[in-house]
């Protein structure tokens, strides 16, 4: 696809999130870069409004699984890469994230190129959270598990849908589940690639910047598409 050509090198990324969870309003700004050749993302996020009212791990899917255009699609899967094909005009990404036995986030993002920079602008609205629950009570560990994001085409909307379950580790050794329902639709009216069913395999590492005084998260992520085998024509080349 034409959009794929925009991802041949390292691309700067800017992320802006405005959120409200149970009336706690906050903003997050992020900067970094992505390299789709390796499916690699390196970003630093700062809460620009003080202390983040929710644990950082609960925002990872919104902040970086938001820029799935940096996923590495192997050669035999490139025709299934909706995300890059929607660029540079970009896509709208909407999610409902339901935390088991707790509240839910609803998010809407616009992901697109502005000049040479890939920008992810997001609004997040969270409701029905327990004040002393795992999320508002900050009981999650500061780490992140590996996950698979399962993608299907949504021909009616000329986009895709994705479902996946995130497992957040809790300080007491248990797990907080977060069900994700995702929909992506192109912003432009050019042709996009509608994929066969497949998944993105994601690995994320969270860390801190020892010199940063503000509430922040440093994130390194690797994402690779999988789940579609080589066709017979590939095997006999």
């Amino acid at each position: 696809s034409k959009g794929e050509e925009l991802f041949t090198g390292v691309v700067p990324i800017l992320v802006e999130l405005d959120g409200d969870v149970n009336g706690h309003k906050f903003s997050v700004s992020g900067e970094g870069e992505g390299d789709a050749t390796y499916g690699k993302l390196t970003l630093k996020f700062i809460c620009t409004t003080g202390k983040l009212p929710v644990p950082w791990p609960t925002l990872v899917t919104t902040l970086t699984y938001g820029v799935q255009c940096f996923s590495r699609y192997p050669d035999h899967m490139k025709r299934h890469d909706f995300f890059k094909s929607a660029m540079p005009e970009g896509y709208v990404q909407e999610r409902t994230i339901s935390f088991k036995d707790d509240g839910n986030y609803k998010t809407r993002a616009e992901v697109k190129f502005e000049g040479d920079t890939l920008v992810n602008r997001i609004e997040l609205k969270g409701i029905d959270f327990k004040e002393d629950g795992n999320i508002l009570g900050h009981k999650l560990e500061y780490n992140y598990n590996s996950h698979n994001v399962y993608i299907t085409a949504d021909k009616q909307k000329n986009g895709i849908k994705a479902n996946f379950k995130i497992r957040h580790n809790i300080e007491d050794g248990s797990v907080q589940l977060a069900d994700h329902y995702q929909q992506n639709t192109p912003i432009g009216d050019g042709p996009v690639l509608l994929p066969d069913n497949h998944y993105l395999s994601t690995q994320s590492a969270l860390s801190k910047d020892p010199n940063e005084k503000r509430d922040h998260m440093v994130l390194l992520e690797f994402v690779t598409a999988a789940g579609i085998t080589h066709g017979m024509d590939e095997l006999y080349k």
Epitope: D18, S27, T49, K106, R108, E110, R121, E123, L124, K125
Partner: nanobody, 126 residues
Framework: QVQLVESGGGLVQTGDSLRLSCAAS????????MGWFRQAPGKEREAVAT????????YYDDSVKGRFTISRDNAANTVYLQMNSLKPEDTAVYYC???????????????????WGQGTQVTVSS
Amino acid sequence: QVQLVESGGGLVQTGDSLRLSCAASLRTFKSYAMGWFRQAPGKEREAVATISAEGDSTYYDDSVKGRFTISRDNAANTVYLQMNSLKPEDTAVYYCAASRFPYGLRLLQRRESDYWGQGTQVTVSS
């Protein structure tokens, strides 16, 4: 051509009420968050109130909480600002704004919008 047209401004006394209206020529009005902003002479434009696309979330600046009420009529493509107990410090040009981001948070926190109206003058004399 998208237009936001404000009306309802005027000159009133301290303690009086006014109702501002903003008519939007947006085909998908019900998917836009809407907001009211104001700008007093020599000051920056500030957010007064915002309302989500579905009308289920509203945000107010602390200075107007309890006095101003924002509402919308998606059938009429119109957003309203009911202003009660007006004070001289409410004197400003009031602008209507529309944002594709549906919860009104981007409007409120970044003061960024897709469309702006031309404004309507509100003057509160003591």
